[in-house]
């Protein structure tokens, strides 16, 4: 009886089970009752990453420097090229097809997590007792100056954008 299902790494064609081509190889011709599936290695700059019956290999991804991309990991016959972004930029998607400049955290916000090649800067509002007076992709919220430890007193209260202003204590005459 002709098979209706095939084993793993096989496919059904013309009522018979043929071996799939291994990763890194493409299908040249299906098997017959006399011959096994004929496969050929993918060419330079091509890949196939699964057991397959593809007649064409996929082209390696091109990391376009004009889009801020660079090669993070060179592709092989079995894997695609992995792109990442140049310093100061990050990917716009998981596929990393283009890059955008890391965002800066505005005054009143500090950097919670510094950007990577694949994720943007994460900002957080400076809580009470902390401030940020610059727009930065690296600066965290800084704690207000402690006037007491300097034997000074607060002359002007701090905000999320400004530090406290310390001044000398009033002396009794």
């Amino acid at each position: 009886e002709p098979p209706t299902a095939c084993r793993e790494k096989q496919y059904l064609i013309n009522s018979q089970c043929c071996s799939l081509c291994q990763p890194g190889q493409k299908l040249v011709s299906d098997c017959t009752e006399f011959t096994e599936t004929e496969c050929l290695p993918c060419g330079e700059s091509e890949f196939l990453d699964t057991w397959n019956r593809e007649t064409h290999c996929h082209q390696h991804k091109y990391c376009d420097p004009n889009l801020g991309l660079r090669v993070q990991q060179k592709g092989t016959s079995e894997t695609d090229t992995i792109c990442t972004c140049e310093e100061g930029w990050h990917c716009t998607s998981e596929a990393c097809e283009s890059c955008v400049l890391h965002r800066s955290c505005s005054p009143g916000f500090g950097v919670k997590q510094i950007a990577t090649g694949v994720s943007d800067t994460i900002c957080e509002p400076c809580p009470v007792g902390f401030f940020s007076n610059v727009s930065s992709a690296f600066e965290k919220c800084h704690p207000w100056t402690s006037c007491e430890t300097k034997d000074l007193v607060v002359q002007q209260a701090g905000t999320n954008k400004t530090d406290v202003v310390c001044g000398p204590q009033d002396r009794l005459r």
Partner: antibody
């Protein structure tokens, strides 16, 4: 018991034709691909032709393509090889073989074809 | 066309000795190779399939190995009935091709 019995061999003049037959028994003939393999005197084995179990697909090496035709009659459990335009270099013992697991798992005893003037 | 080259052409050994026969393919054929034995005046018979798979009814002293381009048929201890010609055959692609054979003869 699987049996393959070839017949139809003999002496033939160059340019003439000959038809070989192979009678199969002991297995379900229509489930198996079949092939012809030949062996020139004192030489090695050479594949000549193959035919799929249903008879729809045939395969030949370049040196016999267009001259030889493989066919089968599943109702008669018989394999054929029609050989036309025979040449001296076609002189050989012709074996009928069954394709099991992509191997030639059973062979007949062969029939001798001599092409000579 | 895939060319199979067998070596040596002739192997002279005594009964009880180990025989190692080689078959080299002109390009990778994965494990798509069979071995056959032919005794004088007889039809060939299948010994090993898919390079290393044993056949029911074939003595365990016959074994095959290899993948890609280099294959070996080993007869662990030669018996008098093992002196014959051995052929490898590829079924990776058309046309089906055989090696030229290795003759194992009594020394």
């Amino acid at each position: 018991e699987v049996q393959l019995v070839e017949s139809g061999g003999g002496v033939v003049q160059p340019g003439r034709s000959l038809r070989l037959s192979c009678a199969a028994s002991g297995f379900t003939f229509s489930n198996y691909g079949m092939s012809w393999v030949r062996q020139a005197p004192g030489k090695g084995l050479e594949w000549v032709a193959s035919i799929s179990s249903g008879g729809d697909d045939t395969y030949y090496p370049d040196n016999v393509k267009g001259r030889f035709t493989i066919s089968r009659d599943n109702s008669k459990n018989t394999l054929y090889l029609q050989m036309n335009s025979l040449r001296a270099e076609d002189t050989a013992v012709y074996y009928c073989t069954r394709a099991g697991g992509k191997a030639m798992d059973y062979w007949g005893q062969g029939t001798l074809v001599t092409v000579s003037s | 066309e895939i060319v199979l080259t067998q070596s040596p052409a002739t192997l002279s050994l005594s009964p009880g000795e180990r025989a190692t026969l080689s078959c080299r393919a002109s390009q990778s054929i994965r494990d798509n190779l069979h071995w056959y034995q032919q005794k004088p005046g007889q039809a060939p018979r299948l010994l090993i399939y898919y390079a290393s798979q044993s056949i029911s009814g074939i003595p365990a002293r016959f074994s095959g190995s290899g993948s890609g381009t280099d294959f070996t048929l080993t007869i662990s201890s030669l018996e008098p009935e093992d002196f014959a010609v051995y052929y490898c055959q590829q079924f990776n692609s058309w046309p089906l091709t055989f090696g030229q054979g290795t003759k194992v003869e009594i020394k």
